[in-house]
């Protein structure tokens, strides 16, 4: 906390400019008007303030806006955003995607901080759902964002937003998350033709039920082993040898290399040896 002291004669700030970097903390407190700071926030980032000086500027804004900053200030916080606590951010009402992008840019290249997580949470809750533009923005900054959401949170993602999801965005999703996302993807891509549909749905198949895998096996999709290995065990177990052979196409030979791994091991165990022998891979049930 900076002590309240009178501003020395001639030091009252008329605008936010580089001369302020020579002000001591107490001078900034005494000589910079909070309302002026709020209207000229966009200038702060161009000035090399010290961390201590930024603390003073934050303190001034906190005093001016005890209930939370207005979006006009938030959008121009820049590096001052890094000084905010999750508690500060919970007071905000961020509705503009441009504001969100501006603040994410400040944290770019770093892991998602508690501040960023709180900001995103506030933004998404304010919008009521995770729309396509928001998802596009968030996954661009944080490819793992989607998989950081709980199944409950994912349930608010509209099928239309699924078009924004790239395969790498699903890399760290667990089976429970894919269980929620798969039906949405199925709905989103339902009007596509066979081969195009498979390209789009492939990354989501870790949430697919047996009947959908059986249907895919009739479409010459040639699923690769990496995708097959991510399928739900309970969805794979009921598949026949013939269905798996059709599903994998030329990739069926890859089963041999994965025979000790789930879900291949579980599937092999539950097949008749005579059926496995038709594959000619030497798989032992």
């Amino acid at each position: 906390e900076v002590e309240k002291t009178a501003c020395p004669s001639g030091k009252k700030a008329r605008e936010i400019d580089e001369s302020l970097i020579f002000y001591k903390k107490w001078e900034l407190e005494a000589c910079v008007d909070a309302a002026l700071l709020a209207t000229q926030m966009d200038r702060v980032n161009a000035i090399p303030f010290t961390y201590e000086q930024l603390d003073v500027l934050k303190h001034k804004l906190d005093e001016l806006y005890p209930q939370g900053y207005p979006e006009s200030v938030i959008q121009h916080l820049g590096y001052l955003f890094l000084k905010m606590s999750p508690e500060d951010i919970r007071k905000w009402n961020v509705t503009s995607l441009e504001t969100l992008k501006a603040l994410l840019e400040v944290n770019k290249g770093h892991e998602m901080s508690p501040q960023v997580a709180t900001l995103i949470d506030r933004f998404v809750k304010g919008r009521g759902q995770l729309d396509k533009d928001t998802l596009d923005t968030l996954t661009a900054f944080y490819p793992g964002y989607l998989c950081s959401l709980s199944p409950e949170e994912l349930s608010s993602v509209p099928p239309s937003s699924i078009w924004a999801v790239r395969p790498q965005d699903l890399d760290t999703c667990d089976p429970r998350q894919l269980d929620v996302l798969y039906p949405k993807a199925r709905l989103a891509f339902q009007n596509m033709n066979g081969s195009e549909y498979f390209v789009k749905i492939q990354s989501f198949l870790g949430g697919a039920p047996t009947e959908d895998l059986k249907a895919l096996s009739q479409q010459n999709v040639s699923m690769d082993l990496a995708t097959f290995m991510k399928l739900r065990t309970d969805a794979v177990l009921p598949l026949t040898v013939a269905e798996v052979q059709k599903l994998l196409g030329p990739h069926v030979e890859g089963l041999k290399a994965e025979e000790r791994h789930r879900p291949v091991r579980d599937w092999i165990l539950r097949q008749r040896q005579d059926d496995l022998d038709t594959l000619g891979l030497g798989l032992q049930g």
Epitope: D174, P175, R176, M229, K230, T233, D234, L237, R260, H261, R262, R265, D266, L269, R270, Q284, G285
Partner: antibody, heavy 119, light 107 residues
Framework: QVQLQESGPGLVKPSETLSLTCTVS??????????WSWIRQPPGKGLEWIGY???????NYNPSLKSRVTISVDTSKNQFSLKLSSVTAADTAVYYC???????????WGQGTMVTVSS | DIQMTQSPSSLSASVGDRVTITCRAS??????LNWYQQKPGKAPKLLIY???SLQSGVPSRFSGSGSGTDFTLTISSLQPEDFATYYC?????????FGGGTKVEIK
């Protein structure tokens, strides 16, 4: 409610064969999704998986014990058994039988039986 | 074989504490990771399967996360009955290995 119960001698001499049986009640050893495992725990140590069997008779053993282990199943008696040959003092442990649901994990365990290898 | 390394091997905590146990696999095991709780003289009990799914009947203060090689078991607010040893286990590879265990003791 499926329950498992281990039975067998609590004392085995070195170089002999340890034999244990697990009786399944309240369910069937012929379940489609389940495999039946043996797991052991030496006194004051961690858990070591020994091997499993499926009702078809297919088995899978811990590579470090494979040469000495045989697991068999008797679907008519709703039992599965463990034989561990050429035992030494290092095989002294609590032996557990357990059901593994392929969709979850070792969800049902027997209460365990202590087997001591000593002359 | 896939090695499973748990840390810490033991920890002291108080009732109400948030406790985190980690498990690392020597190679990727996707989401095939289970967590068990064992109390002295008792058989282990399945808590979490598939890295993050809560086994039926297990209190919601237990949660699991992770995929690939790094996994975490979290107890959000430690209760008196939670003092026990916790084991991770991988069912991905046919060698079914367990971690060395983490003993959670009363501080």
């Amino acid at each position: 409610q499926v329950q498992l119960q281990e039975s067998g001698p609590g004392l085995v001499k070195p170089s002999e064969t340890l034999s244990l049986t697990c009786t399944v009640s309240g369910g069937s050893v012929s379940s489609f999704t389940d495999t039946w495992s043996w797991i052991r725990q030496p006194p004051g140590k961690g858990l070591e998986w020994i091997g499993y069997i499926y009702y078809s008779g297919s088995t899978n053993y811990n590579p470090s014990l494979k040469s000495r282990v045989t697991i068999s199943v008797d679907t008519s008696k709703n039992q599965f058994s463990l034989k561990l040959s050429s035992v030494t003092a290092a095989d002294t442990a609590v032996y557990y039988c357990a059901r593994e649901d392929a969709l979850t994990g070792f969800d049902i365990w027997g209460q365990g039986t202590m087997v001591t290898v000593s002359s | 074989d896939i090695q499973m390394t748990q840390s810490p091997s033991s920890l002291s905590a108080s009732v109400g504490d948030r406790v985190t146990i980690t498990c690392r696999a020597s190679q990727s095991i996707s989401s095939y990771l289970n967590w068990y709780q064992q109390k002295p003289g008792k058989a282990p009990k399945l808590l979490i399967y598939a890295a993050s799914s809560l086994q039926s009947g297990v209190p919601s203060r237990f949660s699991g996360s992770g995929s690939g090689t790094d996994f975490t078991l979290t107890i959000s607010s430690l209760q008196p009955e939670d003092f026990a040893t916790y084991y991770c286990q991988q069912p991905y590879d046919a060698s079914y290995t367990f971690g060395g265990g983490t003993k959670v003791e009363i501080k």
